[in-house]
């Protein structure tokens, strides 16, 4: 802390503010009758340099002039940008014990003259906003620099406002607090910014603009939409705008979309008819405004209006499939299945489905409505039957979809050939086939149907299916396909009144099964052994099992076991073997094989055949 310079004074030449690279002379003078007791010759003045309150240098060697005892002048050079503090102290050389006493101090600021401000930009937000201008100040000056924004216009009137930059605040924007009104739409304004500090001044180039150049309209507000006659595709968008607006931009999109529909509307006066909306769809609408057709700026986008368009009656046709099961000699169960319409076809919330089963000669008609996507009925086995299904929402129903009920696998000549199923990746399977060789009638379409081969899947889960045109011989199935699960895949060929099918199993990814089958019994019949087993639990199969292997060897033998490989069939759970010696004790076990490899062995069973073996 400097004690208000009681002992003396410090002065700077040429000034306490100097340009970068300049030198300064600092003079320290003692006041009369101040100094070291009565020996002026013992007065020694020293100058200390501080940066950020830290002593960085003693300038003892920089003296350029010395009046022993009462004043000294020091030259300082290479000062860095910003503020540096210099403190003059009195050192009484004859008393070494006393520290130097502060005399006075001075701050020297090093900086640069301001550059001409550039890139002036002025805006007024809305017709009732005020003019605010911003600019680029250029290089930091390291000095307090005053900026004056001056706006000149008609009526011989000039407005101005000031702000300053220093090491604590930056001044590169000013709001004049003055509004430009539409009555000045044709007038030209000139704005310039002047910067001034202790080292110089500079002025920007004049920037000229009109009302229309700088006024950014407020975003439209109070946006609403009116659907004409509750139409789901036509609506009138309405909004409030500032009075001078001549051009609007509308953008709208379904909420789950990534691209906007854009419309330009001239002299819309807060109203615009939209004709291409999708019914029963959540939309987002936004509007922007402009005061001039060619010049000026667009407003920010308005707040979003989010609304759902009304429903319209469903369009499109349902994708129907069915299963047929004979119950007894004169009755069959028909299960109809259909896929939900996609939203663009449903055009509303589907309230129910209208299902009709009709005997072609019109003797019998069964009708019902259901909210589900399946329907099961028991009907006579006689007669030719047709089914139709339509979907209904609050506005109406779709056109019914018809399908002839035929014996899906009844005609061998219509069975597709060379059906194969290849895993493409984790979640799909490529099914290929060849057309039926000697079909009596033309194939109208193929249906690829698949179902997980798990217990109860026929009753618990509806099938999945794909309709394939008659000239295609492949299908990539992916719906509900999971890795490590085996699917039964059927390819149906349908003509107008007949059906043929071929079946195959397939998986999208496989591993070796977790365990082998569990042998439950070994029985001897007519000199043959019958091995019975339980299938591997469904989760442990890990894909389609291609075959089972039955292994056996004599107990305590170190020889390689013999084996018998059986083609996997789901319905089969026993198999005969006939190459075992009587009255020899054998150890038997089983494994299962997928395309990925063989399982660990299942349980071991010992057995000693009694009868005569081959």
């Amino acid at each position: 802390n400097i004690d208000v310079c009681k002992l003396g004074t410090v002065t700077v030449q040429p000034a306490p503010v100097i340009p970068l690279g300049s030198a300064a002379n600092i003079s320290c003078s003692l006041n009369p009758k101040q100094g070291c007791s009565h020996y002026p010759s013992s007065n020694e003045l020293i100058l200390l340099k501080f940066v950020n309150d830290v002593l960085v240098e003693n300038l003892h060697g920089k003296k350029v002039h010395d009046h022993t005892g009462h004043s000294s002048t020091f030259q300082v050079t290479n000062l860095s940008l910003g503020m540096t503090l210099f403190v003059c102290k009195l050192n009484c050389s004859n008393s070494q014990k006393k520290p130097p006493v502060p005399v006075c101090g001075v701050e020297i600021s090093v900086g640069v003259a301001p550059e001409p401000p550039q890139n002036i930009s002025c805006v007024q937000e809305g017709e009732n906003g005020t003019v605010a201008c911003s600019w680029n100040s250029g290089k930091v000056t390291y000095l307090k620099t005053n900026y004056t924004l001056q706006l000149s216009g008609p009526n011989n009137l000039t407005c101005q406002k000031q702000c300053f930059s220093d090491n604590r605040q930056n001044c590169n924007r000013l709001d004049l607090g003055i509004n430009l009104s539409p009555d000045l739409a044709e007038s030209r304004f000139i704005v310039r910014v002047t910067a001034i500090n202790d080292l110089g001044n500079s002025s920007s180039l004049p920037h000229t603009f009109t009302f229309l150049d700088i006024v950014i309209p407020l975003p439209p507000w109070d946006i609403r939409i009116n659907f004409l006659n509750a139409s789901g595709s036509r609506g009138t968008l309405q909004w409030e705008d500032e009075g001078q607006v001549v051009l609007n931009q509308l953008r709208y999109q379904p909420l789950n979309s990534t691209s906007w529909n854009m419309v330009n509307a001239t002299n819309a006066k807060g109203k615009y008819d939209l004709r291409d909306l999708r019914p029963f769809t959540e939309y987002e609408f936004q509007i922007s405004s402009k005061l001039h057709l060619s010049g000026g700026s667009w407003s920010n986008w308005s707040e979003s209006l989010r609304t759902r368009t009304p429903e319209e009656e469903p369009v499109g046709i349902l994708d129907i499939w069915y299963m047929k099961q004979d119950i007894d000699y004169d009755r069959q169960q028909i299960s109809l299945f259909w896929k939900s319409l996609n939203p663009s076809e449903a055009r509303g919330k589907i309230l129910h489905y209208q299902v009709t089963l009709q005997e072609v000669t019109k003797k019998t008609t069964l009708q019902n409505t259901t909210r589900h996507t399946s329907w099961t009925r028991v009907i006579p086995r006689t007669g030719a039957w047709t089914a139709s299904v339509s979907a209904a929402n609050s506005k109406g129903a779709s056109a019914p979809t018809h399908i002839n009920i035929v014996d899906l696998c009844g005609t061998g000549l219509l069975a597709p050939h060379q059906v194969s199923a290849k895993s493409e990746n984790m979640d799909n399977i490529l099914v290929t086939w060849q057309p039926p060789k000697k079909a009596d009638s033309a194939v109208r379409e193929y249906i690829v149907e698949w179902r997980a081969l798990q217990p109860g899947s026929i009753t618990k889960f509806p099938p999945h299916w794909l309709r394939i045109p008659p000239d295609n011989m492949s299908a990539l199935i992916s719906e509900n396909i999971k890795p490590y699960i085996c699917y039964e895949i059927r390819v149906h060929a349908l003509s107008e009144s007949q059906g043929g099918c071929s079946s195959i199993r397939g998986d999208s990814k496989h591993k070796a099964p977790v365990s082998g089958p569990h042998i439950t019994a070994i029985t001897e019949k007519k000199e043959r052994l019958f091995i019975s087993w339980t299938h591997i639990p469904f989760p442990e199969q890990r894909g389609c099992i291609l075959h089972y292997r039955i292994y056996w060897k004599e107990r305590d033998s170190t020889a390689q076991p013999e084996l018998c490989e059986i083609q996997y069939r789901r319905s089969q759970n026993s198999h005969p073997i006939s190459s075992l010696q009587p009255r020899v004790t054998y150890v038997l076990w089983m494994t299962a094989v997928t395309a990925a490899g063989e399982s660990p062995q299942g349980n071991e069973r010992e057995f000693c055949p009694q009868g005569k073996a081959n």
Partner: nanobody
Framework: QVQLQESGGGLVQAGGSLRLSCAAS????????MGWFRQAPGKEREFVAA???????LYVDSVKGRFTISRDNAKNTVALQMNSLKPEDTAVYYC???????????????????WGQGTQVTVSS
Amino acid sequence: QVQLQESGGGLVQAGGSLRLSCAASGRTFSNYAMGWFRQAPGKEREFVAAINRSGTTLYVDSVKGRFTISRDNAKNTVALQMNSLKPEDTAVYYCVAGMPFSYSDYPRDSKYDYWGQGTQVTVSS
């Protein structure tokens, strides 16, 4: 309600200076734009200078660079420092308070609700 009282007028030689002051009574002084109009004998009243609530100053081109308007909200005063005076600056100077908003409003006397009695400034050649 705001009352305005001007002072500082007088006779001065061309090239000289005068400082006009205007004292306002009323607590809402800082809400108003303050300004000065003048009226020379036989002429219409004309706008001279104004300062708005945010500190922006406005001048008619004929006085720009010679006159400076300032306000002190703490003291409820507004001042007009007039340098390099010319004989054509001779007029009665009125202190005004109002709420002009747009650039076009400031020179319009109808936009100012409160007026002082006026102080005479005479510049002799």
